[in-house]
Structure formats: structure tokens, C-alpha cells
Interface confidence: low
Amino acid sequence: ALDAAYCFRNVQDNCCLRPLYIDFKRDLGWKWIHEPKGYNANFCAGACPYLWSSDTQHSRVLSLYNTINPEASASPCCVSQDLEPLTILYYIGKTPKIEQLSNMIVKSCKCS
Amino acid sequence: ALDAAYCFRNVQDNCCLRPLYIDFKRDLGWKWIHEPKGYNANFCAGACPYLWSSDTQHSRVLSLYNTINPEASASPCCVSQDLEPLTILYYIGKTPKIEQLSNMIVKSCKCS
């Protein structure tokens, strides 16, 4: 799996999970989240050569097409596969609210 | 929806469905498929600015992050959303076989 266990331990040009820390205030301009101040969102990036973690038959076809026609603009892209929620604390007036934001943390990637 | 009805009628730099005809023999090196000789596979490509057909909360966060940090390499990617199968005819010896290959045709796209 193209997850932290594999990707963070290897130097990998191909599609893999990349570390990314997002500070809510600085990076998103969000001032409404009280806790946490930021989080490890991660992201997916890298090349998608033939059969590298292809998601669908179409992405396999596209990567094979790209191998034979490497200069063509049609190629699969490295995107998130498994995502996890993030629990946040914010305030409405003086009332604290705890909420779970779905699909906030990328855990693994795929070529799609 | 970022489908043919919208994308093929508009000049769109942002994430959209793009036409792509694949010839099995020439483009993939596949000689085993008898019919069709090729098909309209299509593909997805284009930029993913903030809120442009974002797939998940993470892709929305990432596109907002990319707006504020445009030099960063972390940004959502334009990938396939809806896919359809393709029916093919091939031979095993002299015996014709009809099979449906799943997820071969891209019908719409998303930023993920």
C-alpha cells in the first residue's frame, strides 16, 4: 500500500503519500478552529508509470498508453485512496463544540 | 457535472473530461482484441482551483492551501469519477468470446 509505512521510509519518485502539515490559520485562513492549531493532512504526488498501484482498468490502460505514447498528455494521476476524519474543537459564542470533519487526513494513495 | 455534455462544448482549462480515442493495437500493443479495433476511452485533465468540483473535504482543504501557498507542490488532481464498461470480442483459438471489461470508459471527472 502507498501509505506512510512504505512512502515515508523510501525515496520514491512514483505516486506515494507525502507528508504535509497544515496550520489552519496560516495555511487556510481559518480562525474558527480552536483546537488543534493544525494537523498532518498529507497529500499524494508522483508519477504513475504502468501498473504502479493502478486503481481501475482505465488507469491501467492509460498508463500503458502513456508508456507507448510518453509525450501524450493523457496519463493517470496520483490521488488519495484512504482518508480519515479529524476531530476539532470550536466555539459558537462561548459554547465549545466538538465535531468530526470527515475525509481530512490522507492515509494512502493510488493512481487513478 | 464534468462530463461530455459540459466539457466537450466548452473550452475549459480547469479539470474536465477530454476526448481520447485508443487504438488497441497501435496505442496499447494489444493484438488479442478482435472487435472493436479501438474505443473512446477519454481522460481527465486540467487544473483544480478552489472549489472546482472538489471530491472530498481534503481536496477542498488542499485547493485552498494551494491558493494561499501557490508555490507548494500539494494540490488536488483531476481524475475519473464515473466509468463505464466496454464490450469486446476476442478469440481463444477459433472460439469467439464476448466479454465486458469494467471501468474502461471515463464519463465524468472530479478533483481529488
Epitope: D13, A45, P70, E71, S73 | D13, A45, A47, E71, C78
Partner: antibody
């Protein structure tokens, strides 16, 4: 700012070898294809070859065998190794990236942008 | 392998007049429109003006335009300015050819 800068040019004797470097900044070699193009003094442009974002190298038919393109993504550099050099290889050598249009690599469009300033290679005894 | 032939080799045009450069390919360029035009001034690298046969690169004045499809292409400067004095090259992209790209021989544009 996205930039490419060539280095390693100079005077070399016929039959000799030379390795040119193309240092890139502002973008990742994991995401872009980089080409080598040359221009003999007072002549036109001639495509040598490229190395794709995935690491595959492709060459013009005349360059195959004598010229080798490689890259080191960690060092943000692309290289052109030239062997068995001849007087007719005297030229300014440019590296140029495939541009991107709306996030999609343009590839076959031959849309090369940006370019490096070039480095002069002189093959003479 | 593909050969791109530009005509004329040189062109002298009065300021404010129209300049037209032709580019003919010995075989169809990929997708019928994978042709670019470059401008080169002495001591400088080439500058991309037009890609996809007719799409103007960002920042290029709209007096430049490109047209054509398949094997025959044209670059037009509608009203020549002093800063347009340069050598102009066409470049084509090809699929299934051992040479993926080819440049035309160049056309020198001067003021009459």
C-alpha cells in the same frame, strides 16, 4: 520562479566526451519532462531528446547511441552525456521543460517553456 | 521521420504590415494540432509563442496568431512591430515516430 540553467559546456577535442548539466528550480522533476535541444552557430534548432517525469529517456534517431539523458531528482538536475564528439556537434545546448496547460502536461504539443539560457560546446582540435 | 519545412526562409515587412510564415510537415502532427511556434532573438533562447497550433501563450501580444491542422500551419503577425524582428521556428510533436519532435528550419523576419 521556474528556471532551468545549463552548465558544463566548453572546448573538447574530437572523439572526446562531455557531460552537460541542467539545474532546475521552482518545479519538480518528478512532475515534468525535460528536453535537450541544440543550435549550431547560425543554424536552426535541433531536438536531441528528453527524459520524462517517470524517468524514461527518448532520443532523436541521430542522437541514439552517442547521447544519454539522465536525471537526479534529489539534486534537481538533468544531464546530457555526449560521447564520440565531432566538429558538427559544436552548438549551444539548451534544456527546456514541457509546459503545463491548466494542470495537464502538454506532451506532444512540442510546447517547450521555459528554456535555459544555453551553454556553448565547441568541438575542435 | 517527420520533416518540417518553413517558408519563406526570410521575410522583410514594413512596420504595421502583416507577416505570414508557413510550416509544412511531411506527416500529420499528433492529434492534428500538436504544433508550436517559437520566437528567437540573437543571444537568447527561443520563446514559446503558440502551442496546439492556435493557442497563444500567456503574455504574448494578440497580434500573433496561429492556424492550420494536420500538415499545414501558418503563423501570422497582423501588424509587425520593431520588437518582432527575430527568427521564428515551428515545432511539431509526433506519435509513433522515432523522432518525437522536429523543428522547422526557421524564418528570419526583418523590417523593410
Amino acid at each position: 520562479e521556474q528556471q532551468l540553467v545549463e552548465s558544463g559546456g566548453g572546448l573538447v577535442q574530437p572523439g572526446g566526451s562531455l557531460r552537460l548539466s541542467c539545474a532546475v528550480s521552482g518545479f519538480s522533476l518528478s512532475s515534468y519532462t525535460v528536453n535537450w535541444v541544440r543550435q549550431a552557430p547560425g543554424k536552426g534548432l535541433e531536438w536531441i531528446g528528453y527524459i520524462s517525469y517517470g524517468g524514461s529517456a527518448y532520443y532523436a534517431s541521430w542522437a541514439n547511441g552517442r547521447f544519454t539523458i539522465s536525471k537526479d531528482s534529489a539534486k534537481n538536475s538533468v544531464y546530457l552525456q555526449m560521447n564520440s564528439l565531432r566538429a558538427e556537434d559544436t552548438a549551444v545546448y539548451f534544456c527546456a521543460r514541457h509546459m503545463q496547460v491548466g494542470g495537464a502536461p502538454t506532451g506532444s504539443m512540442a510546447a517547450f517553456d521555459p528554456w535555459g539560457p544555453g551553454t556553448l560546446v565547441t568541438v575542435s582540435s | 521521420d517527420a520533416v518540417l519545412t518553413q517558408s519563406p526562409d526570410s521575410l522583410a515587412v514594413s512596420l504595421g504590415e502583416r507577416a505570414t510564415i508557413n510550416c509544412q510537415s511531411s506527416q500529420s502532427v499528433y492529434n492534428n494540432n500538436y504544433l508550436s511556434w517559437f520566437q528567437q532573438k540573437p543571444g537568447q533562447p527561443p520563446k514559446l509563442l503558440i502551442y496546439g497550433a492556435s493557442t497563444l501563450t500567456s503574455g504574448v501580444p494578440d497580434r500573433f496568431s496561429g492556424s492550420g491542422s494536420g500538415t499545414d500551419f501558418t503563423l501570422t503577425i497582423s501588424s509587425l512591430q520593431a520588437e518582432d524582428v527575430a527568427v521564428y521556428y515551428c515545432a511539431g510533436g509526433y506519435s509513433g515516430s522515432s523522432d518525437k519532435y522536429a523543428f522547422g528550419g526557421g524564418t528570419k523576419v526583418e523590417i523593410k
